[in-house]
C-alpha cells in the first residue's frame, strides 16, 4: 500500500480541531505582482514581507511596493509601508538582513533617473523603525555586512567603486575605484579585485587581488594576473593566469594572502572553470571542468592545507560556468554528500559519499519501490535524486533535496528508481539514516519542510490547480495526516518556515483569483497543539550513525570516530522544542587505511584500500610547491584525511623536506607584493 495508508499508522487525535484553532489567515491588500519574505533574527518571530507590483506604461514602468511586518511567526501582519515613506523598494537587492541577532535590515529604494545616488532605509530594531539615508553612489550590489561586525557594510557602485560604511550605512566612503568583486574575509578584512585598463571583463586574467584589514586605511596587493578569487572555510583561493599561455591555475593561501601555494590541480583553459563545491576549516571539494563543452568535470578533495588534492569523482555533472550542479551537502549527517555524474551514454546518475569524498557509491534502492523504465534489470537498480540540474531542466521537481543539522539523519528528496535519473514524474523519498537507506514517502512531486527539529514533516502537493490541503507526519514520513486549511483553494506559491527547522509554524503562501482581482494570502499553521507535551528522556533512543555492520567493532567509524546520537523515537508525538540541542557521544576509532587519502603522486585503484604510485610518476622524485618553496616528499603513499580523528592502528610514514627552491608563479611570490596606505 502507499506510504501513510498502512493499518499500523496511528492517527493524531483530534488534530483537525487543534489545527483549526491554530490556523491564521492573512489577506494582503495587494495586487499580485511578486512577494519576498525574510526572517529577521533567530527565534524572534519577526518576518518582513515585501510585495511589489509593476505596471508597464508606454514610456516607463511604474512600480509600487508594500512592506508588511509580523512579530508572531506570520500569524498576523501589519502594513508598515509608511515607515519607508511609501517608497518603491528594488526587489533585485532583496532585504539585506544583518548577521546573527543584530536586528539590522537594509532596504534599497528605487530612485528617479537624474539623482546623484541611491537611497536606503535602515533599521536596527528588527524593522520597528526605519531611517532614510541618501547614498553618494548608485549601488550595483546588495549591501554586504561584515560577519564580525554588523555596523560595517560594503557595497559596489554602478561606477565600480568600492564603498564602505562603519556606522551601519549612515556615512559612506569610497575606498577604491575600478573594483570588480569584493568579499568580506575574517576579522573585518576585505578582499577585492581591481582592473587597470578598460573594465572587469576586458582585464579578466589581468586583475589584481587586494586586501585591506582596516576598512580602507591601508592596502596590500596580494596577487596579480588574477582571473577570479573565492573564499571557502579558512582558505583563500585565486585562479591565476599562467605566464606563457591562456591557461590558469589555482593558488591557495591560509594566511589571508600573505603567502601562496600552487594547488596540485590541473590547469584549465579559457573555456573551462574551477568551482569550490564545499569548504570547511578542514578541507575543500573542488570541481575542475573538463576541456570542451562536455557538461562534466572532476571533483578533487584537498588536504588540510588546500594544496595536495586527491581525485574524488570522475564525470561530475556541472553544466557550465555558473551553471548547474547537483552537488549537495547532506547537513543532517557528517561526511555525507550527494551529487550527479554524467555517464558515458549521456544518462545522469546519482552518487553518494559517506566519508567526505573518499568513496562514492550509488544510492540503495528503496525497499518499497519498483525499478522504473530506465532499468535494464527490473530487480537491480538505484535511487536517483533530482536536484538543481533537474530543476533547471524544468522537470516536475518543485524542490531540491532537504536536510537540517538538527534533524539528525533525515534527508528528503525527489527521486526516481532505475538505472538513471528519469524525466518521469518523480516521487518523494526519505532517508532517516543520512542516505544509507531510503523509503518512498509521498507519491508524486511535493513541497516539503521540516519543523521542530524533525518532529514534524509538512508537505504540500505540487499542482497546477488551486490547493487547500496540507499533509503532515509526526513519525519521519511513515504515516501522513491531511488537513484542509481553507475552504477556498488558493494558487500555491511557496512554503515558508523559520530557517533552522526549530519552529512549529509553517506559512502557506499563495494567491486567490476572482473575476478581476488577485490577492496575496498567507495561512500560518502552528503545530504546537499537535505535539502536546515536551519530549522526555523516554522519548529518545540511542542511534549509532554510519552503522552498516553492528557485529564489527569499528562499525560507525567515519573519519576516525563514531558518533552515537539521541534521536526521537518515531512513535513519540512530542515537542523537541526551540531549545533542542542535538545530543551526541563521539568515540575515537583506531586508524586504518580508510583514514588516509592517497598522497600526491599516488592513487587508489577501484575497490582497493591501498594507494599505489601513479605509473607516470614511478621512480621520479616527488616534488611540489608549498608557500612558494619547492618541497621534496618522502611518502609511502598516504596522508591523513582532513578532519580525521583516528588514533593508533595503521600509521603510514610521511615526511616533507624543504628543497629551498622557489616555485610559485612569480606573480604571487611575497617579494612582488606591495603595500600602500590611503
Amino acid at each position: 500500500s502507499a506510504p501513510g495508508e498502512d493499518e499500523e499508522c496511528g492517527r493524531v487525535r483530534d488534530f483537525v480541531a487543534k489545527l483549526a484553532n491554530n490556523t491564521h489567515q492573512h489577506v494582503f491588500d495587494d495586487l499580485r505582482g511578486s512577494v519576498s519574505l525574510s526572517w529577521v533574527g533567530d527565534s524572534t518571530g519577526v518576518i518582513l514581507v515585501l510585495t511589489t507590483f509593476h505596471v508597464p506604461l508606454v514610456i516607463m514602468t511604474f512600480g509600487q511596493s508594500k512592506l508588511y511586518r509580523s512579530e508572531d511567526y506570520g500569524k498576523n501582519f501589519k502594513d508598515i509601508t509608511d515607515l519607508i515613506n511609501n517608497t518603491f523598494i528594488r526587489t533585485e537587492f532583496g532585504m539585506a538582513i544583518g548577521p546573527e541577532n543584530s536586528g539590522k535590515v537594509v532596504l534599497t529604494a528605487e530612485v528617479s533617473g537624474g539623482s546623484r545616488g541611491g537611497r536606503i532605509f535602515r533599521s536596527s530594531d528588527f524593522a520597528k523603525n526605519f531611517v532614510q539615508t541618501d547614498l553618494p553612489f548608485h549601488p550595483l550590489t546588495q549591501m554586504m555586512y561584515s560577519p564580525q561586525n554588523s555596523d560595517y557594510l560594503l557595497a559596489l557602485s554602478t561606477e565600480n567603486g568600492l564603498w564602505v560604511s562603519k556606522n551601519f550605512g549612515g556615512k559612506w566612503e569610497e575606498i577604491h575605484k575600478a573594483v570588480c568583486l569584493a568579499k568580506w574575509g575574517s576579522d573585518n578584512t576585505i578582499f577585492f579585485t581591481t582592473y587597470a585598463n578598460g573594465s572587469c571583463k576586458a582585464d579578466l586574467g589581468a586583475l589584481e587581488l587586494w586586501r585591506t584589514s582596516d576598512l580602507g586605511k591601508s592596502f596590500k596587493t596580494i596577487g596579480v594576473k588574477i582571473y577570479s578569487f573565492g573564499l571557502g572555510g579558512r582558505f583563500l583561493f585565486a585562479s591565476v593566469m599562467a605566464d606563457k599561455d591562456t591557461t590558469r591555475r589555482i593558488h591557495v593561501s591560509t594566511d589571508q594572502g600573505d603567502t601562496w601555494s600552487m594547488a596540485q590541480l590541473p590547469s584549465v583553459g579559457q573555456e573551462q572553470f574551477y568551482s569550490i563545491l564545499a569548504a570547511n576549516d578542514d578541507m575543500v571539494f573542488m570541481h575542475v571542468d573538463e576541456p570542451g563543452d562536455t557538461g562534466f568535470g572532476t571533483i578533487f578533495t584537498s588536504d588540510d592545507r588546500g594544496i595536495v588534492y586527491s581525485k574524488s569523482l570522475d564525470r561530475h555533472l556541472y553544466t557550465t560556468t555558473g551553471g548547474e550542479t547537483d552537488f549537495t551537502n547532506v547537513t543532517s549527517l557528517r561526511g555525507v554528500y550527494i551529487t550527479s555524474v554524467l555517464s558515458e551514454d549521456n544518462s545522469i546518475q546519482t552518487m553518494i559519499t559517506f566519508d567526505q569524498g573518499g568513496r562514492w557509491t550509488h544510492l540503495r534502492k528503496p525497499e518499497n519501490s519498483e525499478c522504473d523504465a530506465t532499468a535494464k534489470n527490473k530487480n537491480e537498480c538505484s535511487l536517483h535524486i533530482h536536484a538543481s540540474y533537474s530543476i533547471s531542466q524544468k522537470l516536475n521537481v518543485p524542490m531540491a533535496p532537504l536536510s537540517e543539522p538538527n534533524a539528525v539523519g533525515i534527508v528528503i528528496a525527489h527521486g526516481s528508481v532505475g538505472d538513471a535519473i528519469s524525466v518521469m514524474v518523480p516521487d518523494v523519498y526519505i532517508s532517516d539514516d543520512g542516505g544509507y537507506s531510503w523509503t518512498k514517502m509521498l507519491e508524486g512531486p511535493h513541497y516539503y519542510t521540516i519543523l521542530d527539529s524533525g518532529g514534524i514533516i509538512v508537505a504540500i502537493e505540487h499542482s497546477s490547480r488551486p490547493i487547500n490541503v496540507i499533509k503532515f507526519s509526526t513519525d519521519e514520513g511513515q504515516c501522513w495526516q491531511t488537513y484542509t486549511f481553507t475552504r477556498d483553494p488558493i494558487y500555491f506559491t511557496g512554503l515558508a518556515s523559520e530557517p533552522g527547522a526549530r519552529s512549529m509554524n509553517i506559512s502557506i503562501w499563495g494567491f486567490t483569483e476572482s473575476f478581476l482581482t488577485s490577492q496575496w494570502v498567507s495561512y500560518t499553521i502552528d503545530f504546537k497543539d499537535i505535539l502536546e507535551r515536551n519530549c522526555e528522556e523516554k522519548d529518545y533512543t540511542i542511534w549509532l550513525a554510519h552503522s552498516t555492520d553492528p557485529e564489527d567493532y569499528e562499525d560507525g567509524c567515519i573519519l576516525g570516530y563514531k558518533e552515537q546520537f539521541l534521536r526521537l523515537r518515531k512513535s513519540s508525538v512530542c515537542q523537541n522544542g526551540r531549545d533542542y540541542v542535538v545530543t551526541k557521544q563521539p568515540s575515537i576509532c583506531l586508524c586504518s587505511l580508510e583514514d588516509f587519502l592517497c598522497d600526491f603522486g599516488y592513487y587508489r585503484p577501484e575497490n582497493d584500500s591501498k594507494c599505489v604510485e601513479q605509473p607516470e610518476l614511478k621512480g621520479h622524485d616527488l616534488e611540489f610547491c608549498l608557500y612558494g618553496r619547492e618541497e621534496h616528499l618522502t611518502t609511502n603513499g598516504y596522508r591523513k584525511i582532513p578532519g580525521d580523528k583516528c588514533q593508533g592502528g595503521v600509521n603510514p610514514v610521511r615526511e616533507v623536506k624543504d628543497l629551498k627552491k622557489k616555485c610559485t608563479s612569480n606573480f604571487l611570490s611575497p617579494e612582488k607584493q606591495n603595500s600602500k596606505s590611503n
Epitope: E344, N346, S347, Q393, D419, A420, V423
Partner: antibody, heavy 121, light 107 residues
Framework: QVQLQESGPGLVKPSETLSLTCAVS?????????WGWIRQPPGKGLEWIGS???????YYNPSLKSRVTISVDTSKNQFSLKLSSVTAADTAVYYC??????????????WGQGTLVTVSS | EIVLTQSPATLSVSPGERATLSCRAS??????LAWYQQKPGQAPRLLIY???TRATGIPARFSGSGSGTEFTLTISSLQSEDFAVYYC?????????FGGGTKVEIK
Amino acid sequence: QVQLQESGPGLVKPSETLSLTCAVSGYSISSGYYWGWIRQPPGKGLEWIGSIYHSGNTYYNPSLKSRVTISVDTSKNQFSLKLSSVTAADTAVYYCARGPPELGKMYFQHWGQGTLVTVSS
Amino acid sequence: EIVLTQSPATLSVSPGERATLSCRASQSVSSNLAWYQQKPGQAPRLLIYGASTRATGIPARFSGSGSGTEFTLTISSLQSEDFAVYYCQQDRKGPLTFGGGTKVEIK
C-alpha cells in the same frame, strides 16, 4: 500500450504555418517521457524536428529553430507542432514519437503512423 | 552537427544469410547510437539503443555493436520480414541526427 496519432491538414500553402497535433492514448503525457517530432520527405531519410518534455522544456533542430514551436497540452493528452513560413521543401511525412525516460537521452521507442503534409499552392 | 554515414547504401542478401550494416559517426558519439527498421508505408521501429541493447520485443537475431565512431548492426539470419530500410541515429549531442539509411533487399 501507448499509441500516438498525428492529425492536421494534409495540404498547406507556401508561406503559411503547418500545424499538427499528436494525440496520445494508453499513457498520460504528464507522467513523463520525451515527446518528439520527426519528418521524412518522400523517398528520403529521417530528420529530427524537435522534442519536448511533459514539463514543457523544448529542444529544437537548429536548422528549423526559427520556424518551429512544439507545445504540450496535458489536459488533452496531446502535443503539437507548428512550422511557420513553409515551402515545398517542407513536404514530408511527419511522425510524432515518444522518447526514452532517461534525462539526457533521446532515441524514439514508440512512433505514430505518420501523416503526409504537402506544401503546394 | 554530427554526421552519420551508413554503408552500404543497398545490401543484397539471401534469406537465411547474415547481414552486416555499418554506421560511421563524424565524431565520437560514445555508445549513444540507436538503430531503426522502416518498411514501406510504415513508421520506423526501434531495434537497438545504447549501441547494443535490444529494444523490447526485438528478436535475438538483431544485435548491435561498436562505440565511438564505428557501429555495426548485425542480422544473424535474415527472415523475409527483415527486408527493409535501416537507419542509425545518435543522441550524443544536439541536434539529433539520422544516417542516410541502408536498404536491405532480397538477393
